[in-house]
């Protein structure tokens, strides 16, 4: 199947280059314009002569300038200026500016909240399925393995530092050696990104809202997908995170520290402990092969106990059963032993929704994970309002150039690593990546902040999580101390490293654009974008985990053959785009391939009609359903009862879109199909209106 | 006070069998294991066997199995030791003894004997 | 079955002395040994269990010790009631067996 969504009917012929006419593209001089059918399956389209680039990116000449639809909206200011204002109306705007600050850090703090409580219904969820993951034998032998536990686990239990902690648990107690244990950290640091995915979601009521936050958001993830693919067989083959890690723990004499600070959890747990309250030692035990565990529920019961060891003694079947050779009798019809046992008795009830609703962890995970959502969904669609209401005119402007402005020449530089040292800080203070890209993502959808200062934004909180792995590594118990601290380094390094591939040199910031191009699918068929969400952090880790379960050799027998194609299919893509000459002329273009193998279009009809049955009645009550169901059916009618999305198709029916010049395109291999739309029309809708 | 009571002196005739009770009082009969011990003329002690009065588990010293019967009657809190096949040499006097179940305590309380003679 | 060896068979001595009765097991027991004491003509009574451990209302002066194979119930200073015959049992695997006894006599 071909990489991308539409590979283009570009014909490399030197005369002259036909394409068909998708959608809108940078502004460009006047080229001729013809008609022509491209495929015996569609209908006729308009061709267009394309420049001699050999290119597969759509060339569009349009009559009137459109913008690139990653260049940042202008936030215009329709309301009187301050100047302008009375003394009472100055007052009004000042107490009104006020109420909003209030409102804006009101719904910042439950969205906060409900990403919390979410981490915690995810965990109800599949916690204990988490657990059961970690306590795969193959996990030792078997990178691929470990790295696809990592992404699981974490997206299961919706937090790294979960995971994480299993992990260094695990180390501390022999179960795993810290070898197995950096691809599962490297996995972790993949699932973590699932979050701000999933915010990004939120955003799907406005196209080009969409596809900067989406963009935005999956930028983490590519970051992290990248690094993996570059730098696990790097650690396979030489080990150097281990070595390097190693070094470092055996140079210095550490001494327990203090606890690491809670900086942000301090102002949203007395919030969140009201709603439900975590046992995760469970999850741990789980990991560990405890049996009992498996039968104990995650919902924390007892907040007070009272812990006694005493000694008990237990009937063993002989002598050589005991525990110590010198506490060991018989009474002449059992033999007895004595055992250390720790009593634990239970003083008060922790004070939360669920304490005395005894439901199973599934029902009560479901439910969280249903209101979590809805209150992310809610918050999330009132900070955009909020924002996009304050930041409009000249206070946007500043905003926006404090924010994308690099610093002058020759520094200019230097900008992205301040912002990579802004997002490891900014992560340090609220001790979660997942909250601080979370909270980045809508900023980027609205226009705030480019996709290109949000990246070393990203990476510098990918920086800052490890830092407070680090410091909670450093407060941790004598035993667990070392390997804590080893597998933190290694976490460290590994995004350092990741960090030295794809950001220093411009040319190789593969994320951008990989996102970029994601962004520009999703837009285009927004329900790619939750099928790109289950492929890439479910299907894929479940199948890798499913083929190594059934032994290397089949893993091998199935993975290669994968990969050479996918390789086949890049070098294939990337001779197309840059020299197609050497090229047998069939394999110039995608075109030997049927319709469904390069394009989505065939697809989006499926799903449409899949979808079909919503679109007339799944929306009606309320507008946070709403978005759930313009992303399910990726057609705006399916909204109409609630007025929640204006019908866009129509209004872009029938439009023809002249001939254009090849502009520069952030990636050449997005494909015309996924660019192919004209935000203009769909620059704001009224699916983020309340 | 605790108190282990045995019946009273027996005589006889070998190949013939003899029961030897013993009433306890004074304290919870089923938390404690009653252990039958017996002493030859001028011999030291052999354990002959023990029963858990709570579920009438029991076990004996090899050499008495077949031979002897450990019973106890939760009702009355008395024990009980049938011992059939009577020889010569089975003449001693029978102890009853109490021993903490679960504990290490040893026999701590002892009836005060049972002479049971065999002679023809 | 655990042999228990004790000795001597018999000892003589005076009152205010010091006694030490010994006791060897076959076999390692821990510290599964208890210390009976009957007087003639009556049923014996539990002095020492798990060794060293007194039970109620044993005067201090006996005292026992060991682990392993080797034990001993000492007598720091004899008195004319103690006259009896001492039995030494181990508890560590059944059959529960006993020692043939020493008995301690005044001179």
């Known amino acids: 199947m071909a990489p991308w969504p539409e590979l283009g009917d570009a014909q490399p012929n030197p005369d002259k280059y036909l394409e068909g006419a998708a959608g809108q593209q940078p502004t460009a001089p006047d080229k001729s314009k013809e008609t022509n059918k491209t495929d015996n399956t569609e209908a006729p389209v308009t061709k267009i002569e394309l420049l001699p680039s050999y290119s597969t990116a759509t060339l569009i000449d349009e009559p009137t300038e459109v913008d690139d639809p990653w260049n940042l909206p202008t936030l215009q200011d329709s309301g009187i200026k301050w100047s302008e204002r009375d003394t009472k109306g100055k007052i009004l705007c000042f107490f009104q500016g006020i109420g909003r600050l209030i409102l804006l850090l009101g719904f910042l703090y439950f969205f906060v909240c409900s990403l919390d409580i979410l981490s915690s219904a995810f965990q109800l969820v599949g916690g204990k399925m988490a657990g059961q993951f970690f306590s795969n034998s193959s996990i030792m032998s078997n990178p691929l393995l470990g790295l696809v536990i990592g992404v699981l686990v974490t997206v299961l239990v919706q937090s790294s530092s979960t995971s994480t902690s299993i992990v260094v648990s695990m180390v501390s107690s022999s179960l795993l050696t810290v070898r197995a244990a950096i691809p599962i950290i490297m996995g972790a640091n993949i699932g973590t990104s699932i979050t701000n995915t999933i915010v990004a979601l939120m955003q799907v009521g406005d196209r080009s809202e969409f596809r900067r936050a989406f963009a935005g958001a999956t930028v983490h993830d590519f970051f992290n997908w990248l690094s993996v693919l570059v730098l696990l067989p790097v650690e396979v083959a030489t080990h150097y995170l281990e070595i390097i890690t190693q070094l470092i723990v055996e140079s210095f004499h550490f001494k327990n520290g203090e606890d690491a600070p809670d900086l942000l959890k301090v102002i949203t747990k007395p919030f969140t402990k009201l709603i439900v309250q975590l046992d995760k030692k469970v999850i741990s035990q789980i990991a560990m092969n405890d049996e009992k565990a498996k039968n104990k529920s995650l919902v924390k019961i007892w907040c007070k106990t009272f812990t006694n060891k005493t000694q008990i003694n237990v009937t063993v079947p002989s002598t050589a059963n005991c525990t110590s050779p010198s506490l060991c009798w018989t009474d002449g019809i059992q033999n007895w032993t004595m055992k250390n046992v720790t009593y634990k008795e239970n003083i008060a009830k922790c004070q939360h929704i669920f304490v005395n609703f005894h439901l199973p962890d599934l029902a009560v995970g479901t439910i969280l994970l249903i209101l979590s959502l809805l209150v992310l969904c809610g918050c999330l669609i009132m900070i955009v309002k909020i924002l996009g209401s304050v930041l409009k005119g000249q206070v946007a402007t500043v905003i926006k150039k404090t924010i994308n402005t690099d610093f002058p020449f020759p520094f200019a530089w230097l900008t992205g690593y301040l912002a990579i040292l802004v997002g490891a800080g900014m992560t340090f203070i609220v001790q979660s990546s997942s909250v601080f890209t979370s909270a980045l993502t809508p900023l980027i959808g609205i226009g705030v902040i480019t996709i290109e200062r949000a990246y070393p934004l990203t990476l510098g909180s990918n920086i800052g999580t490890t830092t407070t792995a680090i410091l909670a590594a450093l407060a941790s118990p004598g035993n667990a101390l070392r390997s804590s601290l080893q597998i933190a380094l290694c976490h460290f390094f590994f995004n350092i490293s990741g960090i030295l591939l794809w950001y220093p040199i411009p040319f190789t910031r593969l994320p951008i654009r990989m996102a970029k191009g994601l962004g520009n699918i999703s837009a285009k068929y927004r329900w790619f974008a939750v099928f790109y969400l289950i492929i890439f952090f479910f299907l894929i880790p479940l199948t890798v985990f499913g083929l190594s379960l059934a032994g290397w050799r089949v893993l091998v027998g199935v993975g290669v053959p994968v990969v050479f194609i996918i390789i086949l299919v890049l070098c294939l893509r990337l001779l197309q785009s840059r020299c197609p000459r050497v090229l047998p002329k069939k394999l110039q273009n995608w075109n030997f391939l049927p319709l469904w193998m390069r394009s989505l279009k065939p697809w989006d009809a499926v799903v449409s009609k899949f979808t079909g049955c919503f679109q007339m009645r799944c929306c009606c009550c309320c507008r946070v359903c709403c978005r759930a169901c313009c992303l399910l059916c990726d057609c705006p009618k399916c909204c109409r009862c609630s007025k929640c999305c204006e019908d866009l198709e129509e209004a872009q029916e029938g439009q023809d879109v002249p001939v254009k010049a090849p502009e520069t395109f952030d990636n050449i291999t997005i494909s015309r199909e996924a660019q192919g739309e004209v935000p203009a029309s769909d620059s704001k809708t009224e699916c983020t209106a309340l | 006070q605790v108190q282990l009571v045995q019946s009273g002196a027996e005589v006889k005739k070998p190949g013939s069998s003899v029961k030897v009770s013993c009433k306890t009082s004074g304290f919870f009969f089923t938390e404690y294991i009653i252990h039958w011990v017996r002493q030859a003329p001028g011999q030291g002690l052999e354990w002959i066997g023990g029963i858990i009065p709570n579920n009438d588990v029991t076990n004996y010293k090899q050499n008495f199995r077949g031979r002897v019967t450990l019973t106890a009657d939760k009702s009355t809190s008395t024990a009980y030791m049938e011992l059939s096949s009577l020889r010569s040499e089975d003449t001693a006097v029978y102890y009853c003894?109490?021993?903490?179940?679960?504990?290490?305590?040893?026999?701590?309380?002892w009836g005060q004997g049972t002479t049971v003679t065999v002679s023809s | 079955d655990i042999v228990v060896t004790q000795s001597p068979s018999s000892l003589s001595t005076s009152v205010g002395d010091r006694v030490t009765i010994t006791c060897t097991a076959s076999q390692d027991v821990g510290t599964a040994v208890a210390w009976y004491q009957q007087k003639p003509g009556k049923s014996p009574k539990l002095l020492i269990y798990?060794?060293?451990t007194r039970h109620t209302g044993v005067p201090e002066r006996f005292t026992g010790s060991g682990s392993g194979t080797d034990f001993t119930l000492t007598i720091s200073s004899v008195q004319p009631e103690d006259v009896a015959t001492y039995f030494c049992q181990q508890y560590r695997t059944s059959p529960l067996t006993f020692g043939v006894g020493t008995k301690l006599e005044l001179k």
């Open positions: 798990w060794a060293s």
């Open positions: 003894a109490r021993w903490r179940n679960a504990y290490y305590s040893a026999m701590d309380s």
